[in-house]
């Protein structure tokens, strides 16, 4: 199944003009994501059943080794490039989680809905970040890394990797919301 975010691998050829108050929109999207991140995390680990709800530190700690770094004290350009990488990583990871959860927890419709809503906001955020990078800094290409491929993992590993990613997401989105 296609991942929810396909990053643009392009020169600065923006099809539509950027929104007015682009940075305000980016801040608003980050605040929106930050406001719902904890609820998504709780919904996720609850849906996985035992042993997840009682072993959050062990199973859902934000131990994501290849997660793109973020430096809050950098220039706006540097922060936007790092934000772009993080959003691509989160988007592909969320796509994997959504695909896995539809198979592992087909009746957890509120979880599916929240995952899809989060992916939608991330898509919009990615578009806005790219617009800002292109229009102000003429950056049309950013090297990115993608979230781990969970397709060949067993049931427990799929659940655990998803939980760790959402734990990391909850943590990093708070940092990002503050940094912009």
């Amino acid at each position: 199944s296609p991942l929810p975010i396909t990053p643009v691998n392009a020169t600065c050829a923006i099809r539509h003009p950027c929104h007015n108050n682009l940075m305000n929109q980016i801040r608003s999207q980050l605040a929106q994501l930050n406001g719902s991140a904890n609820a998504l995390f709780i919904l996720y680990y609850t849906a996985q059943g035992e042993p997840f709800p009682n072993n959050l530190d062990k199973l859902c700690g934000p131990n994501v080794t290849d997660f793109p770094p973020f430096h809050a004290n950098g220039t706006e350009k540097a922060k936007l490039v790092e934000l772009y990488r993080i959003v691509v990583y989160l988007g592909t990871s969320l796509g994997n989680i959504t695909r896995d959860q539809k198979i592992l927890n087909p009746s957890a419709l509120s979880l599916h809905s929240k995952l899809n809503a989060t992916a939608d906001i991330l898509r919009g955020l990615l578009s806005n970040v790219l617009c800002r990078l292109c229009s102000k800094y003429h950056v049309g290409h950013v090297d990115v890394t993608y979230g781990p491929d969970t397709s060949g993992k067993d049931v427990f590993q799929k659940k655990k990797l998803g939980c760790q990613l959402l734990g990391k997401y909850k943590q990093i989105i708070a940092v990002l919301a503050q940094a912009f």
Epitope: P51, K153, Q157
Partner: antibody
């Protein structure tokens, strides 16, 4: 219909490497599937050896007690996957089954008929 | 490391009897427990998957129940063709797991 067929030598010398191949027919090997090897010593229960995922990640999981001696690989062009078990002893004498599991890979719904491998000099 | 323990290891029963086999996991496996039937010289055959779902073509006298750590396979009325060995298998975690199968239960004619 889908068929799995194990092939390989029925007799292997101690300390040698046991090599078996499973040929899958009537099935698109590129499909999201896990392929496993399972063995059964004479008169005993089933023992899971390991599996390989046929997909982008190519994940493999092995039984920890056999991990240092086991390699499972796949040849998608031939619709085959293989087992190699090194440094065999008489304790590795068993009927070896290949099996398949559909996403999310939690049960084995496809089985070969099994092949007996005897380790003896 | 999840260990699967099956009981009893063997039992004697008559045609028409109700037979119950249990399987216990050393830690929770949610509902990812499967049951197989094996006859001498044959490959195992999937009977029940994910604790309670009947595999296509399997008679309805076979049923499964349980979740978490404790699971049961029930044959409501034993038939002559049901004399075989039954195995449980956890499909939850293959990581660092020595064996995903239980030790087996041989159902013999009384």
């Amino acid at each position: 219909q889908v068929q799995l067929q194990e092939s390989g030598p029925g007799l292997v010398k101690p300390s040698d490497t046991l090599s078996l191949t499973c040929t899958v027919s009537g099935f698109s090997f590129s499909t999201d599937y896990w392929w496993s090897w399972i063995r059964q010593p004479p008169g005993k229960g089933l023992e899971w050896i390991g599996y390989i995922y046929v997909g982008t990640s190519g994940d493999t999981y092995y039984n920890p007690s056999l991990k240092s001696r086991v390699t499972i690989s796949v040849d998608t062009s031939k619709n085959q996957f293989s087992l190699k078990l090194s440094s065999v002893t008489a304790a590795d004498t068993a009927v070896y089954y290949c099996a398949g599991a559909d996403n999310p890979y939690d049960y084995f719904n496809l089985w070969g008929q099994g092949t007996l491998v005897t380790v003896s000099s | 490391d999840i260990q699967m323990t099956q009981s009893p290891s063997s039992l004697s029963a008559s045609v028409g009897d109700r037979v119950t086999i249990t399987c216990r996991a050393s830690e929770t496996i949610s509902g990812y427990l499967n049951w197989y039937q094996q006859k001498p010289g044959k490959a195992p055959k999937l009977l029940i998957y994910r604790a309670s779902s009947l595999q296509s073509g399997v008679p309805s006298r076979f049923s499964g129940s349980g979740s978490g750590t404790d699971f049961t396979l029930t044959i409501s009325s034993l038939q002559p063709e049901d004399f075989a060995t039954y195995y449980c298998q956890q499909g939850y975690s293959y990581s660092d797991t020595d064996n995903v199968f239980g030790g087996g239960t041989k159902v013999e004619i009384k």
